[in-house]
């Protein structure tokens, strides 16, 4: 009839479908993560350092709607904050759980190593509060089962970092049992029905008005989850559907009213021209930063625009606060059929050409990859672009349907997404061991948090890890110090990483040219997911996507503003 | 791994009715959306009706007035209600899992006299 506080907390992340947990063992976490082999179906990643557990823990979350990360006081909890960091930025629900000293060392203000020495035990839990939702410091048993709900809930519905402490004297107290019999309320509180009837009504006058609509899937209609929504407002209104760089994967690229990849001064021309000369533009999940919007060069010819957030609308100049995008939705989906019935469907921008035939012998370029690789692809896979390169040629390619994205184009921290492949393919094993994970990270970024390879190995996961080798950091080479030393980085030698952090059934390739590119792609045995494969893309110094080469102008015109 | 079930298809005659049910496992839907699809012979798979964690419910106008979908958590399961069936309603009847984009196997359901 009583479980301890330590047990109660994985049961309840069990209970919301977080399955595994990341993070490293500290002395003040030691006895709570004991209880995580009480629970059955739970289990204990254990990272290479915290920095990479938090880049998984966001990973998992943007393929399973939250995650956990375990870390100690201190210095393991200050690892993990740039990842965390990401993860407020970037909208992903992530609950870090920080074992921290006991009450009784806290009150005595002891001189506890892993302190600054000054008794101060609340600094570090102030430093994440800025990049938290929530916090809580439990000091009650009796009220911490409320507490873990309330940050369980927190990190789900708002899709932010949640900050929860557990000091190591508690997590072996009990608490009733009975309280796991009553879930956690996860749904959203519904919307205030004045406030949402002006929305929706508004919404459609604007619609039944429309000549030329679109609508434009943005970040955070994969991370708040209304992907299906979106999908279905394409199917009952047929307007062209266009994604930004942070919206790949939120809606089927190969629906016939799929239209390409907006960023504003970077698109397409004929992307360019059909979102610009929009008259309604119905933009799901906006996050306006600069990566994704070629530099805010949006220039909508139309004042008609619908933001919709998670919690807020915006219609032309006017927001209505609260009013959150997943009910507005829903209910539109009942009506805007009828509001849209006089829309004449026009044509939407023709898809990207395959890449014409070239001899096999021809040296692998970006741009012909990039193209090439929507060939390889499979419904459901999980596509991972490090920032740099990879994250702006993955524009290039279209996405078979059910494809999910993932990149870091707002926060951009280097390497992120080694932790976020580990984390991904956890996920993507607990919800189908065939879904393949797919990353794509330049020789430069790996060297950050190349270390996570060795917890993929560890736990039997097969991601794909397709090393661009362009010999340094090339994202900053266009952006500034083409020929400095700082962006040059000690060649490696990819193909020993794997035997080196101790695979047993792996395969490692070398692809240099489109033959090679050809040969390897399309091998049967190459597309099933049967082991951890690693695979070196040999590819000329400066080779960049055009729209890299584009962006780095930009950023490099306003780092230079006065 | 997460896996939906789909039961309850058939035989049955114009306007009689037909529950449907999906069963889940390797996962606590009680905060994931899930969809109920059909797909007739030679056409697309379509959507028939979704139910949100809060309860919310979908259907397209085929569907409105005659089929009730609803969810009981504490099965991990979801139900398809289908009233006044037509022969038009003949199809595969699949179940999916929205954020993960899961289907179950399908069950058949035929209308006719």
């Known amino acids: 009839s009583e479980i301890t506080l330590g047990k109660y907390l994985f049961e309840r992340l069990k209970q919301v479908n977080v399955n595994t947990v990341f993070g490293l063992p500290g002395d003040f976490n030691l006895s709570l993560l004991d209880k995580i082999y009480e629970v059955e179906g739970m289990r204990w990643a254990g990272n290479a350092n915290e920095l990479n557990a938090a880049y998984a823990a966001d990973g998992y979350a943007r393929i399973k709607g939250m995650s956990c990360i375990i870390t100690t006081f201190g210095v393991g909890e200050l690892s993990a904050l740039n990842g965390i960091a990401g993860s407020y930025a970037e909208h992903v629900g992530v609950l870090h759980v920080v074992g921290v000293p006991s009450i009784s060392a806290q009150a005595k203000q002891l001189l506890l190593h892993h302190t600054l020495g000054n008794g101060d035990f609340t600094v570090f839990h102030r430093m994440s509060a800025n990049i938290s939702e929530t916090t809580a410091m439990i000091t009650d048993i009796a009220t911490a089962p409320a507490e873990i709900d309330r940050c369980i809930r927190t990190t789900y519905v708002t899709q932010r970092p949640v900050y929860l402490g557990l000091p190591a004297n508690l997590v072996d107290l009990n608490v009733p049992a009975k309280l796991l019999q009553t879930p956690i309320d996860m749904s959203l509180k519904p919307n205030d029905a004045e406030s949402e009837k002006e929305v929706i009504d508004t919404i459609l006058a604007l619609v039944k008005d429309a000549k030329n609509p679109v609508i434009l899937a943005d970040a955070c209609c994969s991370r708040h989850d209304v992907k299906a929504e979106t999908k279905k407002l394409i199917d009952l209104t047929q307007f062209p559907a266009f994604v930004t760089p942070m919206g790949k994967g939120s809606i089927d690229e190969q629906h016939p009213r799929y239209g390409g990849v907006y960023v504003g001064t970077l698109s397409k021309p004929e992307v360019k021209e059909a979102v610009e000369s929009a008259d309604l533009i119905l933009s799901v999940g906006a996050l306006l930063s600069d990566f994704n919007t070629g530099s805010f060069s949006y220039s909508y010819k139309t004042k008609n625009i619908v933001e919709f957030h998670s919690d807020h609308m915006k219609i032309r100049n006017a927001t209505f606060p609260g009013v959150q995008m997943k009910f507005v939705l829903q209910k539109l989906l009942t009506t805007i059929a009828d509001a849209a019935k006089g829309y004449k469907p026009v044509a939407v921008p023709a898809r990207t050409p395959a890449n014409a035939a070239v001899p096999a012998s021809t040296p692998l370029k970006q741009e012909w990859m990039w193209n090439q690789l929507g060939n390889f692809l499979q419904e459901g896979d999980v596509v991972i672009a490090e920032t740099g390169t990879s994250a702006f040629g993955i524009n290039q390619t279209t996405f078979p349907n059910n494809t999910y994205g993932i990149s870091q184009v707002l926060w951009g921290s280097i390497g992120f997404t080694t932790g976020a492949t580990l984390g991904a393919a956890f996920a993507a094993e607990e919800i189908d061991p065939k879904k393949r994970v797919i990353l794509f990270i330049g020789d430069g970024s790996l060297q950050l948090t190349v270390q996570e390879i060795s917890t993929m190995i560890r736990w039997g996961l097969k991601p794909y890890l397709f090393v661009l080798n362009n010999d340094g950091y090339t994202i900053e080479k266009l952006i500034h110090g083409p020929k400095a030393q700082y962006n040059e980085i000690q060649g490696w030698d990819h193909l020993s990483l794997l035997p080196t952090f101790g695979a047993k059934d792996y395969e490692t390739h070398r692809v240099a040219t489109t033959g090679e590119w050809d040969k390897l792609t399309q091998d049967k045995s190459f597309n099933d997911n049967s082991k951890i494969r690693m695979i070196e893309i040999m590819l000329p110094v400066f080779d960049a996507p055009q729209n890299l080469v584009e962006q780095a102008k930009l950023t490099a015109a306003t780092n230079a503003k006065q | 791994q997460v896996q939906l079930v789909e039961s309850g298809g058939g035989l049955v005659q114009p306007g009689g009715s037909l529950r449907l049910s999906c069963a889940a496992s390797?996962?606590?839907?009680?905060?994931?959306?899930l969809g109920w699809y059909r797909q007739a012979p030679g056409k697309q798979r379509e959507l028939v009706a979704t139910?949100?964690?809060?309860?919310?419910?979908y259907y397209v106008d085929s569907a409105k007035g005659r089929f009730t979908v609803s969810r009981d958590n504490a099965k991990n399961t979801v139900y398809l209600q289908m009233n006044s069936l037509n022969s038009e309603d003949t199809a595969v009847y699949y179940c999916?899992?929205?954020?993960?984009?899961?289907w179950g196997q399908g069950t058949q359901v035929t209308v006719s006299s």
């Open positions: 139910v949100t964690t809060g309860g919310s419910t």
């Open positions: 390797g996962i606590s839907f009680s905060i994931n959306t």
């Open positions: 999916k899992l929205e954020r993960y984009g899961v």
